[in-house]
């Protein structure tokens, strides 16, 4: 807290300019009018204030706007945004995507801070849903943003927004998140033809059910092993050897290198060894010839 002292003669700030870098904290407090600061916030970002000086400027704005800053000030905060606490940000009503972009730019290249997370939360809640433009903006700054949302939060993403999602945006998503996103992606891309559809849907397939994988196997899609390894184990297990062969196309040879890893390992255990042998890859661990396969899950359901 800066002590209240009178502004020395001749030091009253008539505008926000670089001469203020020479002011002490108490001089900024005494000589800079808060209303002047608010109307010339766009200049602050171009002036090399110290963090100590920024503390004073923030304090002046806090006094002027105890209920929270207006958007006209927020959009010009620049690096003063780094001084804001999540509690400060919760008082804001940010509706403009341009304001959001301006503040995200300040934090660019850094991890998502609690301030940024609060800002995004306030913005998205204010909009009611994660629309395409917002998602475009957020994933441009934070490729992992989508995967930081809970399945419940993801449920508010409209299918139209899925067009903004890039493969790298889904890199850190877990199966529960992909379970929510996949049906939206399927809906978003439903009018595309086979090969184009597969290119778009590929990143979301970690949430695909067995029947969709079976359908894809009929379309000569040549899924790569990296995508196959991200599929839900429970969706892969019911696939036949023939279906997997069609699904992977020339990439089927990669199964050998992955035979000890899920879901390939678990899938091999469910296949007849005879069928696996038809691939000519030397995959071992299938059900030996003459053994009866009981579907215990079906038996439990009947009892």
């Amino acid at each position: 807290e800066v002590e209240k002292t009178a502004c020395p003669s001749g030091k009253k700030a008539r505008e926000i300019d670089e001469s203020l870098i020479f002011y002490k904290k108490w001089e900024l407090e005494a000589c800079v009018d808060a209303a002047l600061l608010a109307t010339q916030m766009d200049r602050v970002n171009a002036i090399p204030f110290t963090y100590e000086q920024l503390d004073v400027l923030k304090h002046k704005l806090d006094e002027l706007y105890p209920q929270g800053y207006p958007e006209s000030v927020i959009q010009h905060l620049g690096y003063l945004f780094l001084k804001m606490s999540p509690e400060d940000i919760r008082k804001w009503n940010v509706t403009s995507l341009e304001t959001l972009k301006a503040l995200l730019e300040v934090n660019k290249g850094h991890e998502m801070s609690p301030q940024v997370a609060t800002l995004i939360d306030r913005f998205v809640k204010g909009r009611g849903q994660l629309d395409k433009d917002t998602l475009d903006t957020l994933t441009a700054f934070y490729p992992g943003y989508l995967c930081s949302l809970s399945p419940e939060e993801l449920s508010s993403v409209p299918p139209s927004s899925i067009w903004a999602v890039r493969p790298q945006d889904l890199d850190t998503c877990d199966p529960r998140q992909l379970d929510v996103l996949y049906p939206k992606a399927r809906l978003a891309f439903q009018n595309m033809n086979g090969s184009e559809y597969f290119v778009k849907i590929q990143s979301f397939l970690g949430g695909a059910p067995t029947e969709d994988l079976k359908a894809l196997s009929q379309q000569n899609v040549s899924m790569d092993l990296a995508t196959f390894m991200k599929l839900r184990t429970d969706a892969v297990l019911p696939l036949t050897v023939a279906e997997v062969q069609k699904l992977l196309g020339p990439h089927v040879e990669g199964l050998k290198a992955e035979e000890r890893h899920r879901p390939v390992r678990d899938w091999i255990l469910r296949q007849r060894q005879d069928d696996l042998d038809t691939l000519g890859l030397g995959l071992q661990g299938g059900i030996p010839n003459g053994y009866l396969v009981l579907d215990l899950s079906m038996q439990e359901a009947l009892s």
């Epitope: 002590e3 870098i21 002490k24 110290t50």
Partner: antibody, heavy 121, light 107 residues
Amino acid sequence: QVQLQESGPGLVKPSETLSLTCTVSGGSISSSSYFWGWIRQPPGKCLEWIGNIYYSGSSNYNPSLKSRVTISVDTSKNQFSLKLSSVTAADTAVYYCARLPRGDRDAFDIWGQGTMVTVSS
Amino acid sequence: EIQMTQSPSSLSASVGDRVTITCRASQGISNYLAWYQQKPGKVPKLLIYAASTLQSGVPSRFSGSGSGTDFTLTISSLQPEDFATYYCQQSYSTPFTFGCGTKVEIK
């Protein structure tokens, strides 16, 4: 280790302009952490602050000298300079350049060795 | 402009003595005060800033205190290399101003 070195004529005629340059070595004048200043000390008298400059070119002068003084910076040469116009014998002094860390309770932490300037015809 | 007045203007002391120098500001300057040491023909050297913070590399026998208008520089046990002139300087507001010095001489 940052060092400062003043240079310029040791003798200036009355009514002319005194020009001095301070060369910064061992560090960059373009650091956002420092101001750079000039201070003088007339023989047997008190130290007097002349002014400060930031690498961006923004400057701040002693009101008693403001009408006659100009401090400038040349980041490409890692130098800052002092010009004092219309000099009189009262401007005879040892002139020091110094570094001032940016902070609320700052003080000149590194000084040049000083250069004696005599104003005389 | 803030005036800085030092006292005494000079003093004589012996090695091992405790020496106290005072500096008074013409108005309150909180703790925006620095102390410098200058030996004949040499450059001023920063000893203390923010009234009581010892500059890196300065011996701990030097200490500063005070706030507002009255400040003190103390040398707890005077050493031969401490005979010099000491200046205070306020950085509360520009123009920065210096005291006119206290010369510490050998008794």
